[in-house]
Amino acid sequence: HTAAQDNCTCPTNKMTVCSPDGPGGRCQCRALGSGMAVDCSTLTSKCLLLKARMSAPKNARTLVRPSEHALVDNDGLYDPDCDPEGRFKARQCNQTSVCWCVNSVGVRRTDKGDLSLRCDELVRTHHILIDLRHRPTAGAFNHSDLDAELRRLFRERYRLHPKFVAAVHYEQPTIQIELRQNTSQKAAGDVDIGDAAYYFERDIKGESLFQGRGGLDLRVRGEPLQVERTLIYYLDEIPPKFSMKRLTA
């Protein structure tokens, strides 16, 4: 696994421990919590990042669910089970044998059950809507400048292929970034939209996951873009399965 060889650090993930004991004596960086070696030339999977975060827990967050099939991360932080590739396992359970099914971004998509609960496959989140509200500015941002800046950010900072940024909408003060990535579209080596969205979310909150880089300094034509609220909605390739009780709550 590649890492900055000179001082053995991981540019893309500061929640790692790096040591020159990898293959061939090269620098190898392990994610905290799991100990899995990570590829420091790209983003680390959200599952490994959540597991690392739980080895030094922070306050959980709560979001709201806006529509019938869109999911929001209402459950906050948990210590996930990751598969050998670092992806979320379809079924997650807590210490008290309460289990639930998650999608590819680790968000619960079923009611909670017991150990008999089956989650046959990891359902892919193919559409992510990032809903931002920016702080008041002297005037509205130019839409095309804002669009270009956010596309550049996802391309350069998060290494997400431009084709996966489907659209950037703007109605002052609300900005919406749509990420789309079907299973068939994602090639080997492509950054996952769920991972890119998670890095972006942490950046916006001032909790950058990048090693040694300054926090996110978003500017549109030199004007700071300061976000005061973020909501992220997740749409899965197969709709979630919640009981009517939850849907009418």
């Epitope: 421990v17 040591s19 020159p20 004991d21 990898g22 190898q28 799991s34 899995m36």
Partner: antibody
Framework: QVQLQQPGAELVRPGASVRLSCKSS????????INWVKQRPGQGLEWIGN????????NYNQKFRDKATLTVDKSSSTAYLQLSSPTSDDSAVYYC????????WGQGTALTVSS | DILLTQSPAILSVSPGERVSFSCRAS??????IHWYQQRTNGSPRLLIS????SISGIPSRFSGSGSGTDFTLLIINSVESEDIADYYC?????????FGSGTKLEVK
């Protein structure tokens, strides 16, 4: 050359806490994991846990989580394994070893728990 | 936890024979497997790291191969009497690291 030095033997009374040491030399102590491995007489090897000396980040085998505590003293390049409330089950040889593929090993400390 | 299964428990060979030890992982661990030799009353020593990387000072008759979950092999091309020892595999894929139960090599 790289060396990990451990005392050859330790005797401890049941229930009395014991601390085993492992002194490193010949490399940058803070840059490599130190692991501890247990071997009971005639048995195989068991990984107890590891510690990364630069900021004392530790991981434990669940089996040893309530038994073992790993620490380091960076000033003397020494790693320690503390065993709480030892019983006869803790009588074993304890090795310290470096890295992820354990390229260097100490000679091992034979711990005897006996009254 | 990742389980490493070593087989057989005991291998008995004649000097000069080629011998292979196997180690199977309960999940895909890529090439994060290491092999050790432990002679009677001695500390283990690293023979092969990351499935196939040779180690300075280890005789060239020792080699390794394999990856994933399949049998990862340690091979001694031509066994010598000094190779009488226990052989262990260990993974470093994720925490906790684990060892196989070992294979004892006897020379006839």
């Amino acid at each position: 050359q790289v060396q990990l030095q451990q005392p050859g033997a330790e005797l401890v009374r049941p229930g009395a806490s014991v601390r085993l040491s492992c002194k490193s030399s010949g490399y940058t102590f803070t840059s490599y994991w130190i692991n501890w491995v247990k071997q009971r007489p005639g048995q195989g090897l068991e990984w107890i846990g590891n510690i990364f000396p630069s900021h004392s980040y530790t991981n434990y085998n669940q089996k040893f989580r309530d038994k073992a505590t790993l620490t380091v003293d960076k000033s003397s390049s020494t790693a320690y394994l503390q065993l709480s409330s030892p019983t006869s089950d803790d009588s074993a040889v304890y090795y310290c070893t470096r890295g992820s593929g354990f390229d260097y090993w100490g000679q091992g400390t034979a711990l005897t728990v006996s009254s | 936890d990742i389980l490493l299964t070593q087989s057989p428990a005991i291998l008995s060979v004649s000097p000069g024979e080629r011998v292979s030890f196997s180690c199977r992982a309960s999940q895909n661990i890529g090439t994060s497997i290491h092999w050790y030799q432990q002679r009677t009353n001695g500390s283990p020593r690293l023979l092969i790291s990351y499935a196939s990387e040779s180690i300075s000072g280890i005789p060239s008759r020792f080699s390794g191969s394999g990856s994933g979950t399949d049998f990862t092999l340690l091979i001694i091309n031509s066994v010598e009497s000094e190779d009488i020892a226990d052989y262990y595999c260990q993974h470093s894929y994720s925490w906790p690291f684990t060892f196989g139960s070992g294979t004892k090599l006897e020379v006839k």
